[in-house]
Interface confidence: low
């Protein structure tokens, strides 16, 4: 349905308070190093003329599309070219290429300083002096620190943040009530911003249809008693919010994403017997729950699968009629018999069933040539299965920070072209499936481990697309979206790697070790891991954990010394030369 | 849910034709394999005809076959059983039903909308 005036329209649908939050999400995401100021100003002056054509939506400039208003608000930042080089470049082109030049300008790891947190009083402090700007700075950092985070989902994440502050800056011990809080909205915001990167990636790399085919095995896990038509009305949909929000239109995606979530809960019925108490909560809320409700339970009786897709002589004319739709509808009933399957497990099945008919329906006796298509599901099945036995096995046996550190110098072996930091983010987050998952009950843990490593290398993609430097990594990231991890974990020692100068500076460290979290710490000894490995890429697990225990009990040595700093420089000169030795460098 | 009207039915003598119509309105989202059963008194609901989503496909039982004619118009949601040389055997209830997917589904199980039946008397 077409309005005369698209701005006034989506501030109307959504609301001043949401709408303004909305544009600066929008602004902050494509002009990362802009200060809040600067985005506070072009906000108001977007949300006062969205007003005059609301007012008069037949008034100069409202009949103009959202990219062109928001594209054009952008273009009068006057720094433009010094602080953004090339992307000024953006402004002299027309829409909708204008637009497209700002999204492939987004930057995934911007260089922006680290969020540190003020004391809990300052904190309280700013958010009683002036809560609207307390809450608009929250969203503007989150947002040019996660150019891709899902704009809706950011509202529900900042009405969080302020019911914290609300609470807690009341509470007799403010930190208490307050520290736990916000330490589980960082980390939720840092998955949900992971998880929302790859759907973004799907999209945008390997296009719609593989989106889509994600959507239908993941619908059809969770809502396993909708009828296939269900399914791929809310596939559709899905789709569309996504493909919004991952290409800037923030506004477009909010708004339908609204009317995805009142569509669901209207049509419960028909959809999940699980959505009940999701669908009386307010809208922010309903649109998460329903995001993350459990599985429905299966219905009962599902007839073999076998009949409609290996025996039925019908099997080439339905797939020759409509191709994606016949697969859709396998996949479908697929994924709604296995929700003890990943999703990338049951589109690489989707895909072997596709690749196996374009065969088959091609030869002279079709049904003997599919006949046995299930058989060369097993091999698929028990791989995941497999690997994810032997890693939780290893991760129960050495706990988190030790099977990190495992994953450290497998991947530093793999690919140790990557970049350090990145290397040590990946393992980390690469890491934390085993206390994510492994606790899991079997029939939950290939869905929980598989799907969630997808995620954590898709930032290794991401990471390395903005400055390739292994060919390898390449190839893995952009061959098959749901054969990356497959395509990481086959992966050996790269043979071809010439190993690092060694550099004393790298091993120096200093005593503001000594002040640092347990966190912190733990990333300063993963980076001397990673860098050791690097110099010496073909030293035994045995050797690497012999510096490894000697570097913890120097740390610990040094940090109980009265003289921290002459501890460092002395102690530190030892080890090197024992590590050097050690490892024949 | 999607809701199925049917419509054509009436008295016809033997040898005579008739067109039947079923309308889909409601939650339609394509694809939608559409079908035609009939049940006499006292008999089981039995197959007629179905078409694929795109009409590329059709199948019949072979009571019918060179006497009946299904098509659809999927732009009005609508789809035909062209009766022709009726016999008094014809006479039953005409069912139009609807199934998301693909294929020349052939049971009564295989669909999940249903429309109330119109009355086709031969005499």
């Known amino acids: 349905d077409a309005h005369k005036s698209e701005v006034a329209h989506r501030f109307k649908d959504l609301g001043e308070e949401n709408f303004k939050a909305l544009v600066l999400i929008a602004f902050a995401q494509y002009l990362q190093q802009c200060p809040f100021e600067d985005h506070v100003k072009l906000v108001n002056e977007v949300t006062e003329f969205a007003k005059t054509c609301v007012a008069d939506e037949s008034a100069e400039n409202c009949d103009k599309s959202l990219h062109t208003l928001f594209g054009d608000k952008l273009c009068t930042v006057a720094t433009l070219r010094e602080t953004y080089g090339e992307m000024a470049d953006c402004c002299a082109k027309q829409e909708p290429e204008r637009n497209e030049c700002f999204l492939q300008h987004k930057d995934d790891n911007p260089n922006l300083p680290r969020l540190v947190r003020p004391e809990v009083d300052v904190m309280c402090t700013a958010f009683h002096d002036n809560e609207e700007t307390f809450l608009k700075k929250y969203l503007y950092e989150i947002a040019r620190r996660h150019p891709y985070f899902y704009a809706p989902e950011l509202l529900f994440f900042a009405k969080r943040y302020k019911a914290a502050f609300t609470e807690c800056c009341q509470a007799a011990d403010k930190a208490a009530c307050l520290l736990p809080k916000l330490d589980e909205l960082r980390d939720e915001g840092k998955a949900s911003s992971a998880k929302q990167r790859l759907k973004c990636a799907s999209l945008q790399k390997f296009g719609e249809r593989a989106f889509k085919a994600w959507a239908v095995a993941r619908l059809s896990q969770r809502f396993p008693k909708a009828e296939f038509a269900e399914v791929s009305k809310l596939v559709t949909d899905l789709t569309k919010v996504h493909t919004e929000c991952c290409h800037g239109d923030l506004l477009e995606c909010a708004d339908d994403r609204a009317d995805l979530a009142k569509y669901i809960c209207e049509n419960q019925d028909s959809i999940s017997s699980k959505l009940k108490e999701c669908c009386e909560k307010p809208l922010l809320e309903k649109s998460h729950c329903i995001a993350e409700v459990e599985n429905d339970e299966m219905p009962a009786d599902l007839p073999s699968l076998a009949a409609d897709f290996v025996e039925s002589k019908d099997v080439c004319k339905n797939y020759a009629e409509a191709k994606d739709v016949f697969l859709g509808m396998f996949l479908y009933e697929y994924a709604r018999r296995h929700p003890d399957y990943s999703v990338v497990l049951l589109l690489r099945l989707a895909k072997t069933y596709e690749t196996t008919l374009e065969k088959c329906c091609a030869a002279a006796d079709p049904h003997e040539c599919y006949a046995k298509v299930f058989d060369e599901f097993k091999p698929l099945v028990e791989e995941p299965q497999n690997l994810i036995k032997q890693n939780c096995e290893l991760f129960e046996q050495l706990g988190e920070y030790k099977f990190q550190n495992a994953l450290l110098v497998r991947y530093t072996k793999k690919v140790p072209q990557v970049s350090t930091p990145t290397l040590v983010e990946v393992s980390r987050n690469l890491g934390k499936v085993g206390s994510k998952c492994c606790k899991h009950p079997e029939a939950k843990r290939m869905p929980c481990a598989e799907d969630y490593l997808s995620v954590v290398l898709n930032q290794l993609c991401v990471l390395h697309e903005k400055t390739p430097v292994s060919d390898r990594v390449t190839k893995c990231c952009t061959e098959s979206l749901v054969n990356r991890r497959p395509c990481f974990s086959a992966l050996e020692v790269d043979e071809t790697y010439v190993p690092k100068e060694f550099n004393a500076e790298t091993f120096t460290f200093h005593a503001d070790i000594c002040t640092l979290s347990e966190k912190e710490r733990q990333i300063k000894k993963q980076t001397a891991l990673v860098e050791l490995v690097k110099h010496k890429p073909k030293a035994t697990k045995e050797q690497l954990k012999a510096v490894m225990d000697d570097f913890a009990a120097f740390v610990e040595k040094c940090c109980k010394a009265d003289d921290k700093e002459t501890c460092f420089a002395e102690e530190g000169k030892k080890l090197v030369a024992a590590s050097q030795a050690a490892l024949g460098l | 849910q999607v809701q199925l009207v049917e419509s054509g039915g009436g008295l016809v003598q033997a040898g005579g034709s008739l067109r039947l119509s079923c309308t889909a309105s409601g939650r339609t989202y394509e694809p939608l394999v559409m079908g035609w059963f009939r049940q006499a008194p006292g008999k089981e609901r039995e197959f007629v005809a179905t078409?694929?989503?795109?009409?590329?496909?059709?199948s019949y039982a072979d009571s019918v076959k060179g006497r009946f004619t299904v098509s659809r118009d999927n732009a009005k949601k609508t789809v035909y059983l062209q009766m022709n040389r009726l016999q008094p055997e014809d006479t039953a209830v005409y069912y139009c039903a609807a199934a998301p997917g693909v294929g020349n589904y052939r049971y009564t199980r295989q669909y999940d909308y249903w429309g109330q039946g119109t009355q086709v008397t031969v005499s």
């Open positions: 078409i694929t989503p795109s009409g590329g496909s059709l």
